[in-house]
């Protein structure tokens, strides 16, 4: 008996004392466990275990299936085993034919046998195939052949377990390996759309994809800082060995305001985890926001091109859109086009063209769109810059010089003198008064300042200028003096 | 060649002590159960006592006549076996045989010439 | 102790002669049996091992049956060579005690 300190529990001792014994078939197996404390025996091969609370284990007429580890334990939970094989000429393996093997480990073929005196115990291919060139086992007769390091490669590898028994090789029923691929890259995922914009009591539903070698990827829907478990529905596909998709939907059957918030697909293996979001927006109506890409206060010279453009978001969908001028909508020389192609896009561009600007062009520009639930508006303020032209230059009965001119900006209107027929003049002349005519009118359009000048000042042949000009450019009109004695004979306006 | 050779028997008074060798060869003496067997002269054999493998945690057993009085020990580096026996008394007189277990079963498949041992005054 | 009792203890035969020999236990040792065959002067010989099994190299005139406590050693044809004293052993419980012997004798 082994050693122990007097008082100190010890194993059962078993009868017959070996470690391994081998019974013919048919025979009688016979184990005594000897111990004051004796509580069982139990039996196990492959997945089945069998109890015995006698002190003697008789199986009368051993079978192949006898065949297995025998154990003995008393009341201290100390044990001692036996493994029994039951020799039988007919049945060499005991096969549990299920085999998985995890890529990069070790897996167990499970063939043990009844008879561990017979050589040659080893992994054969099926059909007389070879093996895999790499492919390593360890032969064990009580446990099976363990397969070192499965690849990826053996995946549905046909197997025999085989020994040589009385100079004959003897082959297992066969065994198809499965192997399940390691995670060597954390899951793919992806969403259907990366943001929502619904209304109240619409459905909302959102479809993760997850991507893994295998099945056995763990995926599920989060709500952002919530715990709330969410109800989604699952497919899934094998693409070929080791190409494994799941699709995840998460439904909201009628959404309101308070599921806004950021939802997550998160998924993860051994090697790591992966997630994508998406943004859910929920209004309890549907909004249009306009954004105007210029000033809404637009200046531009005659004859030149400008372009009103905005931006919009509208959701729903937009669904009229026009421009006006002066209660007119343009049919032509506009475009609407969404912002994106993508397909939760809500934004939109609407540009008016409008080419070679007359001064009589200028005016309120009104942008106008509407969907199912609102309309929304904006306005452009267009004023056309125009050079000064002088509508009337006349001598008035009172003597007075007088200068009328239109143009936008506000005309100035600046007098000088030039005596003789220089027409380069450069004394100015202080004007009597000046007057806006139109300060009152539209507000956009021409602006018309009137500008006099006393002509009795003037004591010399010479030429008068009336120049009015603005930001644009500059016009002049002249009036020539000719004295006769005391008396002005002539006073000729040109221009 | 697969054997076992004894030694270590001869002359002992009663009381006294002797301690007998087997020396094996041939085969992995590590992994086997030993016994020692012994027989008195004219008479039928009788079973001394076993030690296990390492596999049987070196487990030693022996028959009532000798227990207490004879060890069994081992040194499987030297692939050797031993029987060291105390007190010795005449009716250990006896050729003693040292045998080798099978893997799989209790018998003796292997068995040495034997090395006499009297015990005498 | 288990005790093993063998009959005959010695019994005449002549060449060619049918032999058999038993081996009673005292409590069931199953099959957990074994014959020896021992001349004067050598170490025993192993016959049979597991109440039936016949070692490797034994002639297959030699062969042996029973279960439990009943035990047969049987010599089909006895040849010269045969003439010696038999042995059986119980190697259930230990201590692993040996039968008395039978010695077999020329006629």
């Known amino acids: 008996q082994p050693s122990v300190s007097p008082g100190e529990p010890s194993p059962p001792s078993i009868h017959p004392a070996k470690s391994e014994l081998i019974v013919r078939v048919g025979n009688e197996i016979r184990l005594l466990c000897i111990d004051p404390g004796f509580v069982k025996w139990t039996f196990e091969i492959l997945d089945e275990t069998n109890e015995n609370k006698q002190n003697e284990w008789i199986t009368e007429k051993a079978e192949a299936t006898n065949t297995g580890k025998y154990t003995c334990t008393n009341k201290h939970g100390l044990s001692s085993s036996i493994y029994v094989f039951v020799r039988d000429p007919a049945k060499l393996f005991l096969v549990d034919r299920s085999l998985y093997g995890k890529e990069d480990n070790d897996t167990l073929v499970r063939c043990p046998l009844t008879d561990p005196e017979v050589t040659s115990y080893s992994l054969k291919g099926c059909q007389g195939k070879p093996l895999p060139k790499d492919l390593r086992f360890v032969p064990d007769p009580k446990a099976g052949i363990t397969i070192k390091s499965v690849k990826r490669a053996y995946h549905r590898l046909c197997l025999h377990c085989s020994a040589d028994q009385e100079g004959k090789s003897v082959l297992s029923d066969k065994f198809i390996l499965k192997v399940r691929p390691a995670f060597k890259a954390v899951p793919v995922v992806s969403v259907s759309k990366a943001s929502y914009l619904l209304r109240e009591g619409e459905e909302f539903t959102v479809t993760c994809t997850i991507k893994d070698v295998s099945s056995s990827v763990y995926s599920t829907w989060k709500r952002e800082n919530s715990q709330t478990k969410l109800q989604e529905k699952y497919n899934s596909w094998h693409h070929g060995d080791f190409n494994y998709e799941r699709q995840a939907t998460l439904t909201i059957s009628s959404a309101r305001v308070n599921d806004s918030g950021v939802f997550m697909c998160y998924a993860n293996n051994t090697f790591g985890s992966a997630n994508v979001t998406t943004t859910l927006e929920v209004v309890d109506k549907g909004f249009i926001n306009i954004f105007p890409m210029i000033n809404t206060t637009v200046f531009v010279n005659d004859g030149e091109n400008v372009d009103l453009i905005v931006e919009y978001e509208a959701f729903p969908k937009p669904e009229h859109q026009q421009w006006i001028y002066m209660n007119r909508t343009f049919t032509d020389k506009w475009e609407d086009y969404p912002k994106s192609e993508n397909e939760s896009n809500i934004r939109y561009v609407s540009e008016l063209h409008l080419t070679r600007l007359k001064g009589t062009e200028g005016g309120t520009y009104t942008f106008l769109v509407s969907n199912s639930d609102v309309n929304a508006s904006i306005a452009f303020n267009v004023y056309v810059n125009t050079k000064p032209e002088i509508l009337t230059y006349d001598r008035l009965v009172n003597g007075m010089l007088q200068c009328v001119a239109a143009g936008f900006p506000e005309p100035t209107i600046d007098w000088y003198f030039c005596p003789g027929t220089e027409q380069r003049c450069s004394a100015s002349v202080l004007p009597v008064d000046v007057q806006t005519l139109n300060a009152s009118g539209p507000p956009f359009g021409k602006l018309v300042v009137q500008s006099s000048i006393d002509s009795s000042a003037f004591k010399h042949n010479g030429t008068v200028e009336c120049k009015a000009y603005n930001d644009v450019g500059k016009t002049s009109a002249y009036f020539n003096f000719a004295f006769k004695g005391n008396n002005k004979e002539q006073i000729h306006p040109h221009t | 060649e697969v054997q076992l050779v004894e030694s270590g028997g001869g002359l002992v008074q009663p009381g006294g002590s002797l301690r007998l060798s087997c020396a094996a060869s041939?085969?992995?003496?590590?992994?086997?159960?030993m016994d020692w067997v012994r027989q008195a002269p004219g008479k039928g054999l009788e079973w001394v006592g076993r030690?296990?493998?390492?596999?049987?945690?070196?487990?030693?057993e022996y028959a009532a006549s000798v227990k207490g009085r004879f060890t069994i020990s081992r040194d499987d580096s030297k692939n050797s076996l031993y029987l060291q026996m105390n007190s010795l008394k005449t009716e250990d007189t006896a050729v003693y045989y040292c045998?080798?277990?099978?893997?799989?079963?209790?018998?003796?498949?292997?068995w040495g010439r034997g090395t006499l041992v009297t015990v005498s005054s | 102790d288990i005790q093993m009792t063998q009959s005959p203890s010695s019994l005449s035969a002549s060449v060619g002669d049918r032999v058999t020999i038993t081996c009673r236990a005292s409590q069931s040792i199953s099959s957990y049996l074994n014959w020896y065959q021992q001349k004067p002067g050598k170490a025993p010989k192993l016959l049979i091992y597991a109440a039936s099994s016949l070692q490797s190299g034994v002639p297959s005139r030699f062969s042996g049956s029973g279960s439990g406590t009943d035990f047969t050693l049987t010599i089909s044809s006895l040849q010269p060579e045969d003439f010696a004293t038999y042995y059986c052993?119980?190697?259930?419980?230990?201590?692993?005690?040996f039968g008395g012997g039978t010695k077999v004798e020329i006629k």
């Open positions: 030690t296990r493998n390492k596999a049987g945690s070196y487990t030693t």
């Open positions: 045998a080798r277990e099978p893997k799989y079963w209790i018998d003796f498949d292997l």
């Open positions: 052993q119980q190697s259930y419980i230990a201590p692993y005690t």
């Open positions: 041939g085969f992995t003496f590590s992994d086997a159960d």
